[in-house]
């Protein structure tokens, strides 16, 4: 058992001229708070999976109001550390997500409004009991500086918090075969109580005679590395010869979820859905109050001022679960009709409609020409979700209300002159050319390159385009 501790040093604009404006204003004062989510580092969980190692929410920072005209400084931070207790062994490799949230303190109806300013993530190797590790990360235009460490809670010691220490029974030295507990030299390592032969590096125990494996190891003594790449089944126990996991009991057999939690298998392990008042990998963390920040993803915690009274998380749109830890796949209900594309934006659901359909759920079939009149004898053509008028000769525009200038496009070739006419246009061709658009040269001997001009028209006459 132990505690992961996170210290936020600064949150402010990154360097360079494109620094962001302050997230708070005189009209909308605000304050910051942070959330950290921890997962075992080598688990191949989805990004939205619960924070299996735990999570914590900081206190709110001081209220900040932007000074007009001043560049955004590093913003005032909440006091203290974010602490995430862990009950089992510290995994050594862990993933983290740190979110910076803004709480707006203006005149919101229904209380303050929250918005996510920045989110950083990473995977790191970290031994419990080691020094503070520092990090600098950018997220959008913001820069976050922080430190973190994992420390064991007595009597646990060691890089995974799996060794136990006890006060010395004799003042001068430890018992036979027992070493002093560094750095607590006045304490001694507790007698080995794990199953005989249990790997000291990869195994640990919480009860006498047991041998539980750290992530990545298997076998009765935790001496076999898990290698699933060449294995057919993702289940244990292990075949000691191959290091592969061979078919065996499923991860939910015997229900590892405590306190009435329900277990569901995941590709590599299991996931517990905890009842209200409990959380953690196995629903083992209890006595949670709102002060512990149990509501994830911006959920609002209500009640639970003391460990005996349960809290309730009011989840923002798009999240559910007793701790708002589960993302709702609202698009799986196929709310968009008529082939519309569903977009879950977190705060809202949007449907992108196919041509010819409209409405919040694409429920309206657009009769493109309904109520649409095309003027001057034009006819309406449906298509593409918008009406189009096919206009009578001499008219144009969206509704055929504009009188077309048939000569605007300079339709007469070879220097022919264009005249607007009630039925269209007329080209007066230059000498040597003929045709409706003066497109054909007249041969020198008087014969044209095409059949003779229509009766009654000489090759040099204006050709009327009907």
């Amino acid at each position: 058992a132990g505690v992961f501790e996170l210290q936020i040093h600064s949150f402010g604009p990154g360097p360079g001229p494109g620094a962001p404006r302050s997230p708070c204003s005189a009209r909308l004062p605000c304050r910051l708070f942070f959330r950290v989510c921890l997962k075992p580092g080598l688990s191949e969980e989805a990004a939205e999976s619960p924070c299996a190692l735990g999570a914590a929410l900081s206190a709110r920072g001081p209220v900040y109001t932007e000074q007009p005209g001043a560049p955004a400084p590093d913003l005032p931070l909440p006091d203290g550390l974010l602490q995430v207790p862990f009950r089992d062994a510290w995994p050594g490799t862990f993933s983290f997500i740190i979110e910076t949230w803004r709480e707006e303190l203006g005149d919101q109806i229904g209380g303050p409004a929250w918005s996510l300013l920045a989110r950083v993530a990473g995977r790191r190797r970290l031994a419990a009991g080691g020094p503070w590790a520092r990090d600098i990360q950018r997220a959008g235009a913001w820069e976050l500086r922080f430190s973190y460490r994992a420390r064991c809670e007595p009597p646990a010691v060691g890089t995974a918090c799996t060794r136990l220490c006890r006060p010395r029974s004799a003042p001068s030295r430890c018992g036979p075969g027992l070493r002093p507990c560094a750095p607590l030299e006045d304490e001694c390592e507790a007698p080995l109580v794990c199953r005989a032969g249990c790997s000291p590096e990869h195994g640990f125990c919480e009860q006498p005679g047991e041998c539980r494996c750290l992530e990545g190891w298997t076998g009765p003594l935790c001496t076999v590395p898990v290698s699933t790449s060449s294995c057919l089944s993702p289940r244990g126990p292990s075949s000691a010869t191959t290091g592969c996991l061979v078919p065996g009991p499923g991860p939910c057999d015997g229900n590892p979820c405590a306190n009435g939690g329900s277990c569901s298998e995941t590709p590599r392990s299991f996931e517990c859905t905890c009842p209200r008042g409990f959380y953690g990998l196995r629903c083992e963390v209890s006595g949670v109050t709102c002060a512990d920040g149990p509501c994830f993803n911006g959920g609002l915690c209500v009640g639970g001022a003391d460990p005996d009274s349960a809290y309730i998380c009011h989840c923002p749109p798009g999240f559910q679960g007793s701790n708002c830890e589960k993302r709702v796949d609202r698009c799986s209900l196929q709310p968009c009709r008529n082939g519309g594309l569903c977009l879950d934006l977190g705060h809202a659901l949007r449907c992108r409609c196919r041509a010819g359909f409209a409405g919040p759920r694409c429920e309206h079939d657009l009769d493109d020409c309904a109520g649409r009149a095309c003027a001057n004898g034009g006819t309406c053509v449906e298509g593409g979700g918008a009406h189009r008028c096919s206009c009578a000769l001499g008219f144009g525009g969206r509704d055929c209300r504009e009188r077309a200038d048939p000569c605007a496009a300079r339709p007469c070739a070879h220097g022919g002159r264009c005249y607007a006419h009630f039925s269209g246009l007329v080209c007066a061709c230059a000498p040597g050319y003929m045709g409706a658009r003066c497109e054909f040269p007249v041969h020198p001997d008087g014969a044209s390159a095409l059949p003779a001009a229509p009766p009654g028209l000489r090759p040099g006459d204006p050709q009327r385009y009907l």
Epitope: A47, V120, A121, G122, R123, R124, Q137, R138, A139
Partner: antibody, heavy 117, light 107 residues
Framework: QVQLVQSGAEVKKPGASVKVSCKAS????????IHWIRQAPGQGLEWMGY????????EFNQNFKDRVTMTRDTSTSTVYMELSSLRSEDTAVYYC??????????WGQGTTVTVSS | AIQLTQSPSSLSASVGDRVTITCRAS??????LAWYQQKPGKAPKLLIY???SLEDGVPSRFSGSGSGTDFTLTISSLQPEDFATYFC?????????FGGGTKLEIK
């Protein structure tokens, strides 16, 4: 403006060591880490490690862990990277870069190190 | 270490073209991906960080998108100075690793 200026080209024999410097200017040099990245001829980029000039904490790529040392001189805002037990495959351009864990925003001009007998 | 696979490894295009380069990570790296441009004999230059944030001073014709394992760098309208090699880099895990590069050449 921010500048990282590296030392000149080096030619070394196999088994020797090389020490490349990177002088920072235009910003408070303890505010960001200095990373070292190398690029063999015609190849991609390979991260070697970084030093935090404030704490002198270093973290290295396992491929170089036993051969690389990174130090700093606060008085001159200079960071040094020393690579020992050189082999021919260490022939590369060595870059220093300013940054944090998820960005390298300014780079030095590069130092060519040639390892040849 | 996390592997990054860039495609294509080389690409010929003309000034004014829209160009897309992709980078695929061997596992989920959230949005911890950066894009760098490198010209012959020069140091790489940061273009995009955290998948879609444009570094100061980089023209807006460059844009990045994606999260998880699949990422894209798009140049909306190629300019003569954009012909270079482009690298993606993941910063989710230590050690940071780079893609193999995409060489963008004039057609």
């Amino acid at each position: 403006q921010v500048q990282l200026v590296q030392s000149g080209a080096e030619v070394k024999k196999p088994g020797a060591s090389v020490k490349v410097s990177c002088k920072a200017s235009g910003y408070t040099h303890t505010r960001y880490w200095i990373h070292w990245i190398r690029q063999a001829p015609g190849q991609g980029l390979e991260w070697m490690g970084y030093i935090n000039p404030t704490t002198v904490y270093t973290e290295f790529n396992q491929n170089f862990k036993d051969r690389v040392t990174m130090t700093r001189d606060t008085s001159t805002s200079t960071v040094y990277m020393e690579l020992s037990s050189l082999r021919s495959e260490d022939t590369a351009v060595y870059y220093c870069a300013r940054g944090g864990s998820n960005f390298f925003d300014y780079w030095g001009q590069g130092t060519t190190v040639t390892v040849s007998s | 270490a996390i592997q990054l696979t860039q495609s294509p490894s080389s690409l010929s295009a003309s000034v004014g073209d829209r160009v897309t380069i992709t980078c695929r990570a061997s596992e989920n790296i959230y949005y911890n991906l950066a894009w760098y441009q490198q010209k012959p004999g020069k140091a790489p230059k940061l273009l995009i960080y955290t998948a879609n944030s444009l570094e100061d001073g980089v023209p807006s014709r460059f844009s990045g998108s994606g999260s998880g394992t699949d990422f894209t760098l798009t140049i909306s309208s190629l300019q003569p100075e954009d012909f270079a090699t482009y690298f993606c880099k993941q910063a989710y895990d230590v050690p940071p690793t780079f893609g193999g590069g995409t060489k963008l050449e004039i057609k």
